[in-house]
């Protein structure tokens, strides 16, 4: 409920400074509090706008202060208005000159419908003039000058709501400046009744509290609190929760408190008089000192709180045995709470006697929304109310109030909530590499939207189109490898950031999809790579018989060793060879192959081959003749790669013989690099030539080698190979 209080200090204006202070206690109004002149109550009052300022001593309070020189402009009726969530509350009051001819008995008077009412004004100045009485600025009654009594009264035998208003009294020759004002408030209902049709019964509003005719709630006088106003506040405090304090040396002296209708205005407990500057007489207490102490066991009567009961007694007159009531206290509530947006379960914990019940504990949001506990439990000493806010958001940041209202009193504790935005990555993670059962991911956790610091990061993943829960792994580095994935499966990936505090898991960021590779087919078997021409190579393999129905093809990759030249060729799966053409002569190529379906197969080992040469081959090099015996010798040599050398020919003859008497030994395997000549004659000199053949022709030996066999009985000899020019 909105707690709006108007303090009129002082209603009787003399030469002293006077003020109006309007306090929104324990709530934050959506719109500013306004203080204005109440022209409804009094039309012909001063028109000057009011100079309304912020009351620096309170967070939500406005003030109007009149200096003594402005006294002539003050007389009249005023209001203070506060609004929250569409509900407006207006509190009215008046100010009048202390030197007025008449003074009212009270500033306001609250009566029930049907009551027998006397509105009275005390004559202060005696004049030989008629007295006149006005209601809301309109003349209603006059008293001839010789009949003006000491107490001027307006009698209403059966007060009705339409009788309510501001009544003023003055002499006929006077004016607004010399008028006395009192406001009559007539409850719409008869005594103890409330409701639109006034046929519900009020609860008892103790200590001069007033039952609100629309809601049945008690409006408690300044200095009392609780559902039935039974509990006295601490000394010099007021407000629905007694958390406002009178700062004067003598507490609330000279403060007239005005509350929403039908309460009206009264002094704080312990004070009486139009200016609230008179202390209660002994035996009396409460607002305007209207309450009489009737303490049962001779207990002391305190003018502020009433009977001060001995231990073991309670009640207004200490008439009930029992543990004395203890005002509730809110405990273990920090001044500041940082909360992550989303679900929030604030806890209010309170002590007191009787222990607060769940309906007596509430939580008030900064916008004035009142929340009730979702869960409640209590121990011997504490009540714990757990509230649930399903979705708290940054606009909910601000001052929240835990409020406890029991028969023993009311207490409120404001605390600040700072709602943080959960972090969420702006970018989807990137897939760096994949295999059939793994993926390498860059999680791209920054930049992110929302509040840090980031406490931890999770990489979430799951197969697409599977009704599986997301799996996740905690991540510390930006690069992470996901293992044990299913082959040939589309996955979804996203990153979730976690900030400190409960519920700090942010929404997962954008999703990236990727597909793992299939487990590939084995490479073709029986691969063979042979040159076909100077510009072609021929790759062959055994026929492929796939294990599944899937279409397949052979992918052949060939690349040049000498140049950065690569080509991939797709070959229908029913073929067993491919001609690799447009190659360069005398160039080495590396070739590999694999069998692909929708998934890629495993590559074969590399095969290497040269295209056929476009020039004659060079002579074999490093020719050596060794292990010479009387009838044999070993010839060794090396050849250069890349010239398509297909065979080596060794030609030898006895020196001095004719050319046509030579012997040719043709070695058709070009990989053989040595050969043993046999059947030679002992102690004979031979001329040996060696040359290479390729697709173009034979190499041209530059010189011949000499070989001399040993006598029959001699050990083998090595010759450096003497050179003999032809």
């Amino acid at each position: 409920a909105m707690d709006l209080i108007l303090i009129n200090s002082l209603p009787l204006v003399s030469d002293a400074e006077t003020s109006l202070t309007c306090i929104a206690s324990g709530w934050r109004p959506h719109e500013p509090i306004t203080i204005g002149r109440d022209f409804e109550a009094l039309m012909n009052q001063h028109q000057d706008p009011l100079e309304v300022t912020q009351d620096v001593t309170r967070e939500w309070a406005k003030k109007v202060v009149w200096k003594r020189e402005k006294a002539s402009k003050i007389n009249g009726a005023y209001f203070c208005e506060g609004r929250v969530r569409g509900e407006a509350i207006r509190i009215r009051t008046m100010k009048m000159r202390q030197q007025a001819s008449f003074l009212p008995a009270t500033l306001t008077m609250t009566v029930d419908k049907g009551d027998n009412v006397n509105i009275s004004f005390k004559k202060v100045l005696i004049k030989e003039e008629d007295a006149v009485i006005y209601k809301n600025g309109s003349f209603i009654h006059s008293v001839p000058r010789h009949e003006v009594p000491d107490i001027l009264e307006v009698h209403l035998p059966h007060a009705q709501p339409q009788d309510a208003g501001v009544y003023s009294a003055r002499y006929i020759g006077g004016n607004l400046f010399t008028s006395a004002f009192t406001r009559l408030i007539v409850r719409r209902c008869e005594a103890q009744k409330w409701g639109p049709e006034c046929n519900h019964l009020c609860t008892a509003c103790m200590n001069n509290g007033v039952c609100h005719e629309d809601t049945g709630e008690c409006i408690c006088p300044p200095g009392f609190m609780g559902r039935t106003c039974e509990k006295a506040c601490e000394l010099h405090t007021f407000g629905r929760t007694c958390k406002e304090r009178c700062s004067g040396q003598e507490g609330c002296k000279s403060y007239v408190f005005c509350l929403p209708d039908p309460y009206g205005c009264s002094c704080a407990t312990g004070w009486k008089g139009l200016q609230c500057n008179e202390a209660c007489h002994p035996g009396f207490y409460g607002p305007d000192c209207k309450l009489r102490c009737s303490c049962n066991n001779g207990e002391m009567c305190d003018r502020f709180q009433g009977c001060l009961c001995s231990p073991g007694w309670q009640g207004l007159q200490c008439e009930r045995e029992g543990i004395p009531r203890m005002t509730p206290k809110i405990v273990d509530l920090p001044d500041h709470i940082e909360v992550n947006s989303g679900k929030f379960n604030p806890i209010c914990k309170a002590s007191g006697w009787p222990l607060p019940t769940n309906e007596e504990m509430t939580l008030v949001k900064p916008d004035g929304t009142v929340l009730h506990p979702k869960d409640f439990n209590h121990t011997d000493h504490f009540s714990v109310a757990i509230f649930t806010i399903h979705r708290i958001l940054p606009p909910d940041s601000g001052v929240w109030v835990c409020s406890v209202n029991t028969v023993a009193g009311m207490v409120e504790k404001p605390f600040n909530i700072s709602v943080k935005v959960l972090p969420k990555p702006l970018n989807a993670p990137n897939v760096i590499d994949t295999g059939h059962n793994f993926a390498v991911i860059n999680i791209s956790s920054e930049p992110y939207f929302g509040d840090g610091p980031i406490k931890s990061k999770k990489l979430l993943y799951k197969p697409v189109n599977h009704y599986e829960a997301w799996q996740h792994i905690q991540v510390t580095n930006e690069i992470v490898t996901l293992n044990y994935l299913e082959p040939r499966t589309e996955y979804e990936l996203c990153v979730q950031l976690v900030r400190r505090g409960e519920g700090g898991e942010g929404h997962p960021g954008p999703v990236r999809r990727f597909t793992t590779a299939s487990i590939g087919l084995p490479p073709p078997r029986g691969l063979n790579l042979l040159p076909k021409s100077q510009t072609t190579l021929n790759l062959t393999w055994q026929p492929i018989f796939p294990s599944s129905e899937d279409d397949f093809y052979v992918e052949v990759e060939r690349r040049s060793v000498q140049k950065s030249d690569q080509q991939n060729i797709k070959v229908p799966g029913n073929l067993t060879s491919v001609l690799l053409n447009n190659l360069h002569p005398r160039e080495q190529y590396v070739v590999r192959a694999r069998v692909n379906t929708k998934a890629q197969g495993e590559w074969s080992e590399d095969l290497t081959a040269w295209t056929l040469s476009d020039i004659l081959p060079p002579q074999p090099e490093n020719i050596k003749i060794s292990n010479i015996t009387h009838s044999s010798a070993v010839i060794s040599w090396t050849i250069l790669d890349g010239y398509s050398i297909s065979s080596i020919t060794i030609r030898y003859k006895v020196q001095g013989k004719n050319e046509d008497q030579h012997v040719d030994v043709k070695i058709k395997n070009a990989t053989i690099t040595q050969y043993q000549l046999k059947g030679l004659e002992p102690e004979t000199a031979y001329q040996v030539d060696i040359f290479a053949e390729n697709n173009i022709g034979s190499s041209n030996p530059a010189f011949s080698h000499e070989l001399v066999t040993l006598p029959e009985s001699q050990a083998p000899a090595d010759l450096g190979g003497g050179k003999m020019l032809l």
Partner: antibody
Framework: QVQLVQSGGGVVQPGRSLRLSCAAS????????MHWVRQAPGKGLEWVAV????????YYADSVKGRFTISRDNSKNMLQLQMNRLRSEDTAVYYC??????????WGQGTVITVSS | DIQMTQSPDSLAVSLGERATINCKSS????????????LAWYQQKPGQPPNLLMY???TRESGVPDRFSGSGSGTDFTLTISSLQAEDVAVYYC?????????FGQGTRLEIK
């Protein structure tokens, strides 16, 4: 905790009388108006009577007016319903309740009255 | 007296689904002076007394889960359970307190489909 504990139910013949009681604890009983509400077997709720906090004002449903009397003893935190000239249609579970404004906030556990010959 | 009529008399709703109970008064229970609707909702489980859920038509009583919400004004009101739970199986009553005597609707039995 606020509690309302009821007693006094039973089986009674038509035309006879019965007295129901409701003992309150955990609240300042003398500050609250109190209600009686009844519920016939398998039927809805029917308000019966209310009494003001000081016992000065009492109101009754037309169906029980002149036969039932609501009363309270604030010194004992006790609410009563004296039921005379009972009829078969008075057979019901009777509840005492405290109001929150015009809604009924705290209810007793209920007591069964069976009017049968 | 103000008559209160609820509809439907009984209602079967699947768990997790929305349940809606209507209440109609024979005259307006909206008081124009404070713009409040003088209407309450109760839940009653077998063998238990009624439990206050809502007052002023839409103010949730403390301890009542926020899946319960009240709406409407004047003569037509609705109690909504946004996501039905097993423990919500009960009879629900509306009650006006605009005028004495306070009167209740005949009740709506809510079951799980």
């Amino acid at each position: 905790q606020v509690q309302l504990v009821q007693s006094g139910g039973g089986v009674v013949q038509p035309g006879r009388s019965l007295r129901l009681s409701c003992a309150a604890s955990g609240l300042t009983f003398s500050n609250y108006a109190m209600h009686w509400v009844r519920q016939a077997p398998g039927k809805g709720l029917e308000w019966v009577a209310v009494i003001s906090y000081d016992g000065e004002n009492k109101y009754y449903a037309d169906s029980v007016k002149g036969r039932f009397t609501i009363s309270r003893d604030n010194s004992k935190n006790m609410l009563q319903l004296q039921m005379n000239r009972l009829r078969s249609e008075d057979t019901a579970v009777y509840y005492c309740a405290t109001p929150k404004g015009g809604a009924l906030e705290i209810w007793g556990q209920g007591t069964v009255i069976t009017v049968s010959s | 007296d103000i008559q209160m009529t609820q509809s439907p008399d009984s209602l079967a709703v699947s768990l997790g689904e929305r349940a809606t109970i209507n209440c109609k008064s024979s005259q307006s229970v909206l008081y124009s002076s404070n713009n409040k609707n003088y209407l309450a909702w109760y839940q009653q489980k077998p063998g238990q007394p009624p439990n206050l859920l809502m007052y002023w038509a839409s103010t949730r009583e403390s301890g009542v889960p926020d899946r319960f919400s009240g709406s409407g004004s004047g003569t037509d009101f609705t109690l909504t359970i946004s996501s039905l739970q097993a423990e919500d199986v009960a009879v629900y009553y509306c009650q006006q307190y605009y005028s004495a005597p306070i009167t209740f609707g005949q009740g709506t039995r809510l079951e799980i489909k």
